[in-house]
Interface confidence: medium
């Protein structure tokens, strides 16, 4: 009798639908070739296919097998009009699985899914299931047609991880799930505003998002020129304002406010605000004569371009005299004063058009 082939190996590619059949050749010499048959088992509906290949071949392929259907595959050794007993095995070609599932349009209560519909006439649609990560029972399930490549899952909880699966469906079978995990967003606050700006303080307000389950708000702030130097404040969810203190004068800050919902943060609401200039301090007078004196002060912390000094007799309603000095100086001698008169002297630090609060002192000639 003819010896059958040995070591039958079946491999179905779910993406292409191609079944590859391979074997080790018969030990019988001078055979004509091999006959390979694929037949649905147990009388299931489906194509029965047959191939005959040359004796020097040890594999062949079949197209158009129905995924999810069980096939019996047999390979016979053929010599002229004789056949060996077959070597046989069964295989169920897998239902093709999505390979390019991705998430789009993520909000606090919805996640959009996108994929490329598979090009196979046997696919009748897709099943979408949603499970809260760590839970077993799907909280949501829906079916879409085979031509559909987009779906929005709605009614989700904010800031929660969801395992979302898309399963390819055929008549009487389905693919393994393509599963990805995605977290819904936490709704951010809106309408960031800055008020009560001082040299080292500012009040930050925002509109809370429409949520009553927030854990807190996170306010982060840092100088624009040194964003690594970040300070962070946790604010009660019932508050929508905070006063930032101990800031650097004349410094632009970047401020962000995020909603926090059970350890999950929203995208930050960001804004920039510059603190005011601080005043010069420590006004002092020296070299007092009948018609002159020298005014001294300590420079402010802020970066400035110069100072404006005004002076006038104490009970004088006219325009004061004005002098300007560069930022490198911290004294000025006022001359041509009236003897025996009390003068009011005010000093303002300048940075371009920006002015600090006044530093005021009084001195008599």
């Amino acid at each position: 009798p003819l010896s059958p082939p040995t070591n039958l190996h079946l491999e179905a590619n779910p993406d292409t639908g191609v079944l590859t059949v391979s074997w080790e050749r018969s030990t019988t010499p001078d055979i004509t070739g091999y006959r390979i048959t694929t037949t649905p088992t147990n009388g299931q509906q489906g194509n029965s296919l047959e191939e005959v290949v040359h004796a020097d071949q040890s594999s062949c392929t079949f197209d158009n097998l129905s995924p999810g259907l069980e096939y019996n595959v047999s390979v016979y050794t053929v010599k002229d009009d004789k056949e060996s007993v077959p070597i046989s095995d069964t295989i169920i070609p897998e239902v093709p699985q999505l390979t390019d599932l991705s998430f789009v349009d993520i909000t606090d209560s919805s996640i959009g899914l996108r994929w490329t519909p598979l090009n196979s006439s046997t696919i009748i649609g897709y099943r979408i299931t949603v499970v809260a990560a760590g839970e077993g029972i799907p909280i949501f399930e829906d079916f879409v047609d085979s031509s559909v490549g987009y779906y929005t899952v709605t009614g989700l909880e904010p800031g929660i991880d969801y395992d979302i699966s898309v399963i390819t469906l055929i008549n009487g079978g389905e693919s393994a799930p393509t599963t990805l995990t995605q977290q819904t967003a936490v709704p951010p606050p809106t309408d960031l505003r800055f008020t009560n700006i001082g040299p080292d303080t500012m009040r930050v307000t925002w509109a809370p998002p429409p949520s009553i389950d927030l854990t807190n708000f996170l306010v982060r702030y840092s100088p624009v020129k040194n964003e690594e130097d970040v300070a962070e404040l946790s604010i009660s969810p019932s508050d929508n304002a905070v006063v930032l203190t101990n800031l650097l004068p004349g410094t632009e800050y970047v401020v962000s406010v995020s909603s926090v919902y059970e350890q999950h943060e929203s995208t930050p609401l960001r804004g920039r605000q510059k603190t005011g200039l601080d005043s010069p301090t420590g006004i002092d007078f020296s070299d007092i004569t009948a018609n002159s004196f020298t005014v001294h002060w300590i420079a402010p912390r802020a970066t400035i371009t110069g100072y404006r000094i005004r002076h006038h007799p104490e009970h004088f309603s006219g325009r004061p005299r004005e002098d300007r000095v560069p930022h490198s100086r911290n004294s000025i001698t006022l001359t041509n004063l009236t003897p025996g008169t009390e003068y009011v002297v005010s000093i303002v630090a300048l940075n371009g058009r920006e002015e600090s609060p006044l530093l005021i002192g009084q001195q008599s000639t």
Partner: antibody, heavy 123, light 113 residues
Amino acid sequence: EVQLVESGGGLVQPKGSLKISCAASGLTFNTYAMNWVRQAPRKGLEWVARIRSKSNNYATYYADSVKDRFTISRDDSQSMLYLQMNNLKTEDTAMYYCVKQGGNSLYWYFDVWGAGTTVTVSS
Amino acid sequence: DIVMSQSPSSLAVSVGEKVTMSCKSSQSLLYSSNQKNYLAWYQQRPGQSPKLLIYWASTGESGVPDRFTGSGSGTDFTLTISSVKAEDLAVYYCQQYYSYPLTFGAGTKLELK
């Protein structure tokens, strides 16, 4: 069809206690936040209490008017919602509705209401 | 707390008439991030429990007749019944779900002339 059926209402004296119940059917009870809303005779609606699902650690929320006196709880295995009311006051006299929350935990509109159970606080 | 004010408190109508009722909130119920208004409308027929009609200010609940429409944004909202039927005689409540605590309006009672 989703159904919520309240029970346990009745007449109770001021400073007394009462526990009312709500049996839910036709829904996956354990996935929803549930609420109690009340309506005093010939008056409007007032939200009373809320309990979230297990995945949200059964977090509870109360109106200021009932805080520290009322306790909301649930038994997911029985699809039951409860409201334990202590130190009752005459102003707690109302029809108490068991209410399912629509949307998700940020969206507190109420899409299914029970028929209500009457609580009367009077000496 | 957000205060919800409804007007009128009662309204006498004839069957077939078009009716509008107003609901105003003490602060905006519009969330700029998603452009949604966090407002719902309920109907309470005599001796019955309330029933959800509209949410997101203008989205009709499944099964609600399309003669009921909600409109408005920010702080001013309207419920319109295009042609009143006898079964529409009820009290209508608006409710905000923008912030804690949830608050309802005092209601508008629809009565027959």
